[in-house]
């Protein structure tokens, strides 16, 4: 039948009529850095060009016998998953293979670097259409490999990599940890993270999304018409490379940032059983399974945003954590989270000419995370307006006073160790949507943006006493840009965006013995771009 | 014989060369750093990627590689330049003893050095 994985990456048909997938990838070239491949396999014959690039270490063991079918196994299967005739994702995509892994599936960082350099030189010598580079490999964290990936990405190449099969934090591996690379974890037919022997898919904040990666049927190097089932984050990454090729072929001008945002936006949300991940990694790991866009049109008007978590700050008193957006994304809001609840908030600040989100640990805290909301907002002009602690009054307020600027996010930062001992502020009065409000002993930061047709509104949901979690979501057609909590007491562990929902976590009232007067409110800022909507209507 | 990419394949055990001076000592206050894989079994000691500062030209990369070879030779060490990088990152890949790391980190234009390590099919 039709393989389960191809069904899984296809969006459910919401009309009785036929789902038209985007272009099959015909304008895109996919580079595969892997083992050697069996290029005359029926699935990939005429679709894959084997380059003369080879940089592999000697096989281990004196008695190792090179057997062609074993040497070609991994690469052949992946080439089939990307563009195979019967079981491939992007059947129109052409591929080029570079051999950087030996017959045992082992390579080196240096060999991979030289392979990436080869691709860059090929691109310069003969510029073609969009390029996707698939790196179905992983090693330990490597500064140089990540740097090379960054350079290639900044040259306009889309890099897709396996998160790794070590049932571990993907940030400890390369190229999975490179922020510019699209890092893919693996799920199975039941939307469970894939278990591989005693290990399994990697997870954590360095994973961008998951994709099918268990029992994936594809070309087998045992014979030119054979098929075999393989599992791993390589297979998952191959699906995303195929989806990327189809999306880029339909819209060749897409930037890496635009492609990543679309991959996230069109993914199936909240289908993965998170219980499989270690508890401390659940909040950091995206609950997203890759899927093709529902149709070729209609995405352009969307205001796309994603959530970027920082590394953990560490526990020292003055420790901070920084979350950064990609070069062509706008930081529209900044929040923070601490499992212990001991934090000193967050602020948006300029670093190297770009806004970053910095979270501050507090004395006795186990550390904090900074959470950036990174959005695609063409022709945006954003700035941060700060109000110092009001001290005497009920709360600190700041608003967007520039003509045409709208509020996209609120942050608060305080120097006192424990805001919980101080009287909480009154909530923001109604009818003043362009205003941030916070504790009187906190400085408040408003992210104010001007962009064509940008409109935003504030949505709140409060509960009388902390109950672990309060959420508020933006309606259909609106995108969550800001997520914060009122008040900033020590009961609040922090706030963060999950897709289009603002989540505020607080200590459970039963464990803290707090009084019911300490209401916790989740405050979402929801935006949309009339300009983008009109522009896309004019195109259609 | 070097090819167009500057991939030096010869083993060098040279006498002191003109380039073995300190004409281009590293700028004051900038110390190059050494990195290696945190997973011990995956380390490949003896092969190092020497990454040079961003704006370094190919000719400077080649000169820095030759300087390392000359300085190593003076100390009685064999080195082999396996590849000179340009296009993505400036730098070179060198096969040498770990004893030479301290020396290599002091070379001009060096940003950091990373010991080679293994990657695996996933």
């Amino acid at each position: 039948s039709i393989p389960w994985n191809l069904e899984r990456i296809t969006p459910p048909r919401y009309r009785a009529d036929e789902y038209q997938p985007p272009d099959g990838g015909s304008l895109v070239e996919v580079y595969l850095l892997d083992t050697s491949i069996q290029s005359d396999h029926r699935e990939i014959e005429g679709r894959v060009m084997v380059t003369d690039f080879e940089n592999v270490p000697e096989e281990d063991g004196t008695r190792f016998h090179r057997q062609a079918s074993k040497c070609d196994s991994h690469g052949t299967h992946l080439a089939g998953v990307v563009s195979g005739r019967d079981a491939g994702v992007a059947k129109g995509a052409s591929m080029r293979s570079l051999r950087v892994l030996n017959c045992q599936g082992k390579g080196t960082v240096s060999g991979t670097l030289i392979g990436l350099e080869f691709i860059r030189k090929s691109q310069l010598v003969q510029p073609v259409g969009p390029l996707v580079v698939l790196l179905p490999l992983a090693g330990g964290y490597s500064r140089v490999l990540n740097a090379a990936c960054q350079r290639l990405a900044r040259a306009g190449v889309v890099l897709v990599t396996a998160a790794g099969n070590f049932r571990d934090d993907a940030c400890l591996y390369s190229p999975a940890s490179a922020p510019e690379v699209i890092t893919v974890g693996a799920t199975n037919a039941q939307d469970q993270p894939v278990t591989l022997g005693t290990l399994g898919t990697n997870f954590g904040r360095c994973v961008d999304l998951f994709a099918p990666g268990e029992d994936i049927i594809g070309a087998s190097s045992d014979c030119s018409t054979c098929f075999v089932s393989q599992s791993g984050t390589s297979q998952a990454a191959a699906h995303v490379a195929g989806i990327a090729a189809m999306m880029l072929s339909a819209e060749p001008e897409l930037t890496l940032a635009e492609l990543r945002q679309r991959l996230i936006h069109f993914s199936a949300k909240d289908v993965i059983n998170e219980a499989w991940f270690p508890e401390d990694q659940r909040v950091l790991t995206p609950n997203l399974v890759a899927a093709l866009p529902p149709s070729t049109h209609g995405a352009g008007w969307q205001l796309f945003c994603r959530t970027v978590w920082s590394a953990h700050s560490g526990p020292t008193r003055m420790a901070t954590a920084i979350a950064r957006c990609a070069p062509d994304e706008e930081l529209l809001s900044c929040s923070s989270f601490s499992r212990s609840g001991k934090r000193r908030g967050e602020r948006m600040e300029a670093q190297g000419g770009k806004l970053v989100c910095r979270a501050h640990n507090a004395f006795g805290g186990e550390g904090v995370y900074a959470i950036a909301r990174c959005c695609l907002l063409p022709q945006a002009n954003c700035s941060v307006h700060t109000a110092p602690p009001a001290e005497a009054s009920m709360g600190t307020r700041v608003h967007c006073h520039q003509q045409g600027h709208v509020l996209t996010g609120c942050s608060s930062h305080w120097e006192v160790e424990d805001l919980g001992t101080h009287k909480p502020p009154v909530l923001r009065p109604r009818g003043q949507p362009n205003q941030c409000v916070g504790h009187r002993e906190a400085s408040i930061h408003a992210s104010c943006c001007h962009a064509p047709g940008l409109e935003c509104k504030v949505k709140e949901h409060g509960i009388p006493a902390p109950q672990g979690q309060v959420t508020v979501a933006c309606e259909e057609g609106w995108t969550l840009t800001g997520c914060s909590a009122l008040p900033g007491t020590s009961h609040v562990l922090g706030a963060y965006a999950v897709d289009n929902t603002c989540v505020v976590r607080s200590r459970d009232v039963s464990t803290t013995g707090s009084t019911s007067e300490e209401a916790v409110t989740a405050v979402a800022i929801c935006c949309r771009s009339r300009h983008l909507a009109q522009a896309s209507q004019e195109l259609q | 014989q070097e090819d167009e990419d500057g991939d030096y394949e010869e083993l060098v055990l040279a006498l002191r060369s003109e380039e073995d001076g300190l004409a281009e000592a590293p700028e004051h206050g900038t110390t190059a750093t050494f990195h290696r894989c945190a997973k011990d079994p995956w380390r490949l000691p003896g092969t190092y990627v020497v990454v040079l500062k961003e704006e370094t030209h190919l000719s400077q990369s080649e000169r820095t590689a030759r300087r390392l070879q000359a300085q190593a030779a003076r100390r009685g060490y064999l080195t082999k330049i396996l590849h000179v990088f340009h296009g993505l990152l400036p730098g070179f890949l060198v096969k040498m003893s770990g004893d030479l790391l301290e020396l290599a980190l002091k070379l001009p234009h060096v940003d950091y050095i990373e010991e080679d390590s293994s990657v695996f099919a996933q």
């Epitope: 296809t10 459910p12 009785a16 009529d17 036929e18 | -």
Partner: antibody
Framework: EVQLVESGGGLVQPGGSLRLSCVVS????????MSWVRQAPGKGLEWVAN????????YYVDSVKGRFTISRDNAKNSLYLQMNSLRAEDTAVYYC????????????WGQGTMVTVSS | QSVLTQPPSASGTPGQRVTISCSGS????????VNWYQQVPGTAPKLLIY???QRPLGVPDRFSGSKSGTSASLAISGLQSEDEADYYC??????????FGGGTKLTVL
Amino acid sequence: EVQLVESGGGLVQPGGSLRLSCVVSGFTFSSYWMSWVRQAPGKGLEWVANIKQDGSEKYYVDSVKGRFTISRDNAKNSLYLQMNSLRAEDTAVYYCARESNWGFAFDIWGQGTMVTVSS
Amino acid sequence: QSVLTQPPSASGTPGQRVTISCSGSSSNIGSKTVNWYQQVPGTAPKLLIYRNNQRPLGVPDRFSGSKSGTSASLAISGLQSEDEADYYCAAWDDSLNWVFGGGTKLTVL
């Protein structure tokens, strides 16, 4: 393993009613349009009806409109066909089939259940 | 009377190439993709070709599909005795119905 299992067929008199069921396993039922297809003895395949993932849209072949009702219960992974005012020409093997999202085709079929309308 | 038109029968000897045609209109084949099903007597139909020319896994590459205008065809090369079955074409129609061909009985002589 992906499976569709039909039941509820049997002998019924003209004008009578019957309710067919199809129980699904091995895939996310709520992600798919589902169809009923029938085959009269010695004849070809004829599509009867289909239903959207959430049950909000239903389509029927003209010959059964107003008599047959397709429905589903996603919680029970079940598809139904309520057949009223049955006629002799409704005699057939009734198959339930999944409509592939990727392929836009009936990619998984049940084994069929026989409905005989006769006095 | 089926909406899509197929020849009622076709035959060939082992090893031969056989083609089965399927004719429709602009409201179905002309604007939609075509699927082909194989039905061995006494069993449920099986998807053979989808989206005009795509093969599900497990279908030998002896089977191929094509479409041109409002017609489609199924080709079977290297005919084998196990190919003896009924073959149906199908497509979605603008009338919001799935439509089938009347079926072609293939005999391997």
